[in-house]
Amino acid sequence: ELCDDDPPEIPHATFKAMAYKEGTMLNCECKRGFRRIKSGSLYMLCTGNSSHSSWDNQCQCTSSATRNTTKQVTPQPEEQKERKTTEMQSPMQPVDQASLPGHCREPPPWENEATERIYHFVVGQMVYYQCVQGYRALHRGPAESVCKMTHGKTRWTQPQLICTGEMETSQFPGEEKPQASPEGRPESETSCLVTTTDFQIQTEMAATMETSIFTTEYQ
């Protein structure tokens, strides 16, 4: 079951998953000037059995300018640099978390992927919060959020974290001091990891009382 909403927003904080539950989708997106290969996958999917989980499908990008020429999928060593993953940079994966049964690790980068990764989380997913550079964490409780199903609806628990404007960075649970903290991003960019299904739309078909997610019309 996909989580309907985004994880909660905490002012001056970003979040990331240490590992991804089976059923998680990752959009296959390419950077500007590149596109998915013909007949390519639209997304990767974390799948597995009781003993092993892995990402199904491979995202592949090819130059928009050329036809039928596929760029290599496995990045060269010099390309394996820090990348944005969901709202975070540089996935710092504690082995114990990434090796959880029924979970996938952060997928390796593919060549010419978009600068931002979009994940679609499933029920039971946990994300961890960290204050952005220049802010210090005041913990009232766990700095994490879990997607839970209650009464047939999904919801994210509220992380107990306040980020205050002091020049000191916080760390993820169990981490040593990071060499560099993730930079904060403009608020307009911190949207939409998953979306709500509670779209209430009145269609122009007044004869029915149905609601639907989209209204279509031609111009």
Epitope: L2, D6, M25, N27, E29, C30, R35, R36, K38, S39, G40, S41, L42, Y43, L45, D56, A114, I118, H120, S191, C192, L193, V194, T195, T196, T197, D198, F199, Q200, I201, S212, I213, F214
Partner: antibody, heavy 104, light 107 residues
């Protein structure tokens, strides 16, 4: 025939998401045909080869609206055009009511 | 492109009947298959995703199975509201493709 049509698809009551918006058409008495889709947060569109060069799918995040423009219309483009929220592996779970386009 | 072939193209059945519709893919699509129901003048409705997972709100008399190239959707006891056209759809690769549809009619 020969003209263009632009169909709009507005989402409201929630965030205009990172899921794809797919466009599917259905000619009278025929089956469903996927034309293409777009992920609004990225703005990149993906088209079925059959429509490549004739269809343009765009999205305006500020108004939570996706658009499908089909050019060089011919009589066989007469169909109902649907938009749908496409959750990939999890299916197209919510659909618009459809827009009938008649080319005559 | 992956071709989805549905059979039968139409069938007649009575209320209470067990109905099975088959969908075959031209290549393996693992379990990347969805089923939709469409009634006249209405938009399609998602019934089953990932070959066998029931969409929220869909009655439990609907079930799906299969993996690779062969898939089925079964209605265990046909109800009056189930008379409609049923489509399969693969999400394994682009372009996304649908089966030709199966029209379930009243006998």
């Amino acid at each position: 025939p020969g003209s263009s049509v632009k169909v709009s698809c507005k989402a409201s009551g929630g965030t205009f998401s990172s899921y794809a918006i797919s466009w599917v058409r259905q000619a009278p008495g025929q089956g469903l045909e996927w034309m293409g889709g777009i992920i609004p947060i990225f703005g990149t569109a993906n088209y079925a080869q059959k429509f490549q060069g004739r269809v343009t799918i765009t999205a305006d995040k500020s108004t939570s609206t996706a658009y499908m423009e089909l050019s060089s219309l011919r009589s066989e483009d007469t169909a109902v055009y649907y938009c749908a929220r496409d959750k990939g592996y999890y299916g197209m779970d919510v659909w618009g009511q459809g827009t009938t386009v008649t080319v005559s | 492109d992956i071709v989805m072939t549905q059979s039968p193209s139409s069938l007649s059945a009575s209320i209470g009947d067990r109905v099975t519709i088959t969908c075959r893919a031209s290549q393996s699509i693992k379990n990347y298959l969805n089923w939709y129901q469409q009634k006249p003048g209405k938009a399609p409705k998602l019934l089953i995703y990932a070959a066998s997972s029931l969409q929220n709100g869909v009655p439990s008399r609907f079930s799906g199975s299969g993996s690779g190239t062969d898939f089925t959707v079964t209605i265990s006891s046909l109800q009056p509201e189930d008379f409609a056209i049923y489509y399969c759809q693969q999400t394994y690769s682009t372009p996304l493709t649908f089966g030709g549809g199966t029209n379930v009619e009243i006998k």
